[in-house]
């Protein structure tokens, strides 16, 4: 494959469970896959009571919701677990909501993780 | 290599629910979707739902809707699709795959509804 | 979403090149580069063969090729083999805000 500006070759790594999932808790993740399919970046969190808890972060497959995103933001209006994807490496490292509603203006909040 | 390996057949009554799993592995489970689709006897393929394995997001058709429920376990990378309100027309083999472009597909299950 | 309309059945000889067609709307299969083709063998679950309109599956013979005309995808396998005989489904992506949806399918014999 030809690598574009955009092609993801590596993703900040996340996961709230790692001591259940065996895995890191954070770093960054390489991502694999069919040399002709495109990857993607993505972060899931959830707002419990306007806090911010990452939920995971790392690579994603091949998805047509992510093509073209530079940046990684939510437009599902007031999901359970938030989920954003993007491409280009690292584009995970910050996430944003933009609810799409048709009447009102999305307001913007925009997250940049801290380590816990 | 990826492999998605479902359970194994199914005899169920009308009026009762089935669900069938789907054990990813080969991969990093929370990294796609999980689609499901069935084919009955002498028929085509039907999609019936997807579920986003990380965030947990479902979708269903409108054929399905309430009917069925589709939940992923990260913890063990199995998949699960639950029909419930079995009648007849459900006997099919029922299949998870791979991604939103079905990449890898499970060996199906059949499911035979019969009184 | 309605189903996506192929023909019951196409056939061709070995060597021959034949094409199977899959038609949507101008919202689905016109507008967008989702369509994807799986082959089925009896009795075994379909294979990716190929996606969004015209990439080839990894490990797929160059033979099999995809492409898009308006509301109507197609696919083409050229120097047909007797092997290639199978049923033959487009489908669409089906993820996040997407939707699935199938082809009747199509039956292809090798005569």
């Known amino acids: 494959a030809i690598l574009g500006r955009s092609e993801t070759q590596e993703c900040i790594f996340y996961n709230a469970n790692w001591e259940r999932d065996r895995t890191n808790r954070t770093g960054v993740e390489s991502c694999y896959g069919d040399k002709d399919k495109r990857r993607h970046c993505f972060a899931t969190w959830k707002n419990i009571s306007g806090s911010i808890e990452i939920v995971k972060q790392g690579c994603w497959l091949d998805d047509i919701n992510c093509y073209d995103r530079t940046d990684c933001i939510e437009k599902k209006d007031s999901p359970e677990v938030y989920f954003c994807c993007c491409e280009g490496s690292m584009c995970n490292e910050r996430f944003s909501y933009f609810p799409e509603m048709e009447v009102t203006q999305p307001t913007s909040n925009p997250v940049t993780p801290k380590p816990p | 290599q990826v492999q998605l390996v479902q359970s194994g057949a199914e005899v169920k009554k009308p009026g009762s629910s089935v669900k069938v799993s789907c054990k990813a592995s080969?991969?990093?489970?929370?990294?796609?979707?999980i689609n499901w689709v069935r084919q009955a006897p002498g028929q085509g393929l039907e999609w019936m739902g997807t579920?986003?394995?990380?965030?947990?997001?479902?979708s269903y058709a409108q054929k399905f809707q309430g009917r069925v429920t589709i939940t992923a376990d990260t913890s063990t990378s199995t998949a699960y699709m639950e029909l419930s309100s079995l009648r007849s027309e459900d006997t099919a083999v029922y299949y998870c795959?791979?991604?939103?472009?079905?990449?890898?597909w499970g060996q199906g299950t059949l499911v035979t509804v019969s009184s | 979403q309605s189903a996506l309309t192929q023909p019951r059945s196409v056939s061709g000889s070995p060597g021959q090149s034949v094409t199977i067609s899959c038609t949507g709307t101008?919202?689905?299969?016109?507008?967008?580069?989702?369509v994807n083709w799986y082959q089925q063998h009896p009795g075994k679950a379909p294979k990716l063969m190929i996606y969004?309109?015209?990439k080839r599956e990894s490990g797929v013979p160059d033979r099999f090729s995809g492409s898009k005309s308006g509301n109507t995808a197609s696919l083409t396998i050229s120097g047909l083999q007797a092997e290639d005989e199978a049923d033959y489904y487009c489908?669409?992506?089906?993820?996040?805000?997407?939707?699935?949806?199938f082809g009747g399918g199509t039956k292809l014999t090798v005569l």
């Open positions: 579920i986003n394995a990380v965030s947990g997001s479902t």
């Open positions: 969004g309109v015209s």
């Open positions: 080969g991969y990093t489970f929370t990294s796609s979707y």
């Open positions: 489908g669409t992506f089906a993820g996040g805000k997407y939707y699935g949806v």
């Open positions: 795959a791979r991604g939103g472009w079905f990449d890898y």
């Open positions: 101008s919202s689905d299969v016109g507008s967008k580069n989702y």
